[in-house]
């Protein structure tokens, strides 16, 4: 397994589990079904991953190629400011919002969008690849 936290860069790890996509140095899971934000988070954590934390504009642009108009939950929440689940602030992109009750973050091909956390959306998990796929 990759060493370090869920949020490490894991550059030396080779492969991804079934139904996960390898992109750069990480594995990404794009859900088919829809869940609320908390359930999406639990899904990812149960698979030794986390709701997508985007590190920079480059990663965001690469991922948006695989997205449609449909929104996907990501690991972004508004707790006195927009923060990723690893604790870092959102500082490379703006997020659209229409209401103060929209405190969870989502992404689609057009960018970041706030939403009420209870809304069922697709979601994206991110994790380090495994050295041996049988470990999954």
């Amino acid at each position: 397994l990759c060493q370090g936290s869920n949020y490490s860069t894991c550059a030396s790890c080779p492969s991804c589990p079934d139904r996960w996509m390898k992109y750069g140095n990480h594995c990404y899971y794009f859900s088919v079904e829809e869940k609320d934000w908390n359930s999406s988070l639990e899904f990812c954590l149960a698979r030794d991953s986390h709701l997508l934390v985007i590190t920079d504009n480059q990663e965001m642009s690469l991922l948006q190629v695989f997205l449609s108009e449909a929104f996907c939950w990501i690991g972004l929440r508004n707790n006195s400011g927009w923060r990723w689940e690893d604790g870092s602030p959102l500082n490379f992109s703006r997020i659209s919002s229409n209401s103060f009750v929209q405190t969870c973050g989502a992404i689609n091909k057009n960018g970041l969008q706030a939403s009420s956390c209870e809304v069922p959306l697709h979601w994206v998990c991110k994790k380090c690849p495994f050295a041996d796929q049988a470990l999954f």
Partner: antibody, heavy 118, light 107 residues
Framework: QVQLQQPGAEFVKPGASVKLSCKAS????????IHWMKQRPGQGLEWIGN????????NYNEKFKNRATLTVDTSSSTAYMQFRSLTSDDSAVYYC???????????WGQGTLVTVSA | NVLTQSPAIMSASPGEKVTMTCRAS???????LHWYQQKSGASPKIWIY???NLASAVPARFSGSGSGTSYSLTISSVEAEDAATYYC?????????FGGGTKLEIK
């Protein structure tokens, strides 16, 4: 497609109560806030309150808090607003509306015209 | 947060440019300031959201701008079908509030 269906009209006597319905279809009812608005003839819109059907938690405009009660029946995907102690000032069109992720209140019912008259 | 719209009623000829304003009693995030169009006998429709984003199917002659306590809706070249009442609304806190509306009449 998302639809909010409201009855066209209700006639009530002063001092009585009325329970207005808003039947939702075309989406997961428990996942989006339902708002209620009042509009007197020729006047502007007033927000009465909202309810989140998934948990039945709600918020009220202080002006209406003592006389309005918002409830839902998730089995029939219907939101209700009960209004008590009606007077002629309550004669108005009452709208329900649903929020969304991108646009704030893109879905509105057709409104129920409540007439309070002896 | 009280929203005050002006003018209450305005009249314009087809092709004219018109601007209506919405002033808030306290600052509103531009994300949370929206405009609705309501035609006689119909339900309101979301028209411009988050200050400047046109709702789907809204003609490009409409635009919105503003920040803080002052917002506006502009129609670059009015058409007959724009006759309606326009309401601003804030979603920055409870209670949600609407402005009193600006009724646009076409000459």
């Amino acid at each position: 497609q998302v639809q909010l269906q409201q009855p066209g009209a209700e006639f009530v006597k002063p001092g009585a109560s009325v329970k207005l319905s808003c039947k939702a279809s075309g989406y997961t009812f428990t996942s989006y806030w339902i708002h209620w608005m009042k509009q007197r003839p020729g006047q502007g819109l007033e927000w009465i309150g909202n309810i989140y059907p998934g948990r039945s938690n709600n918020n009220y405009n202080e002006k209406f808090k003592n006389r309005a009660t918002l409830t839902v029946d998730t089995s029939s995907s219907t939101a209700y607003m009960q209004f008590r102690s009606l007077t002629s000032d309550d004669s108005a069109v009452y709208y329900c509306a649903r929020d969304a992720t991108v646009e704030p209140l893109p879905y509105w019912g057709q409104g129920t015209l409540v007439t309070v008259s002896a | 947060n009280v929203l005050t719209q002006s003018p209450a009623i305005m009249s314009a000829s087809p092709g004219e440019k018109v601007t209506m304003t919405c002033r808030a009693s306290s600052s509103v995030s531009s994300n949370y300031l929206h405009w609705y169009q309501q035609k006689s006998g119909a339900s309101p429709k979301i028209w411009i959201y988050s200050t400047s984003n046109l709702a789907s199917a809204v003609p490009a002659r409409f635009s919105g701008s503003g920040s803080g306590t002052s917002y506006s809706l502009t129609i670059s070249s009015v058409e007959a079908e724009d006759a309606a009442t326009y309401y601003c609304q804030q979603y920055s806190g409870y209670p949600l509030t609407f402005g009193g509306g600006t009724k646009l009449e076409i000459k």
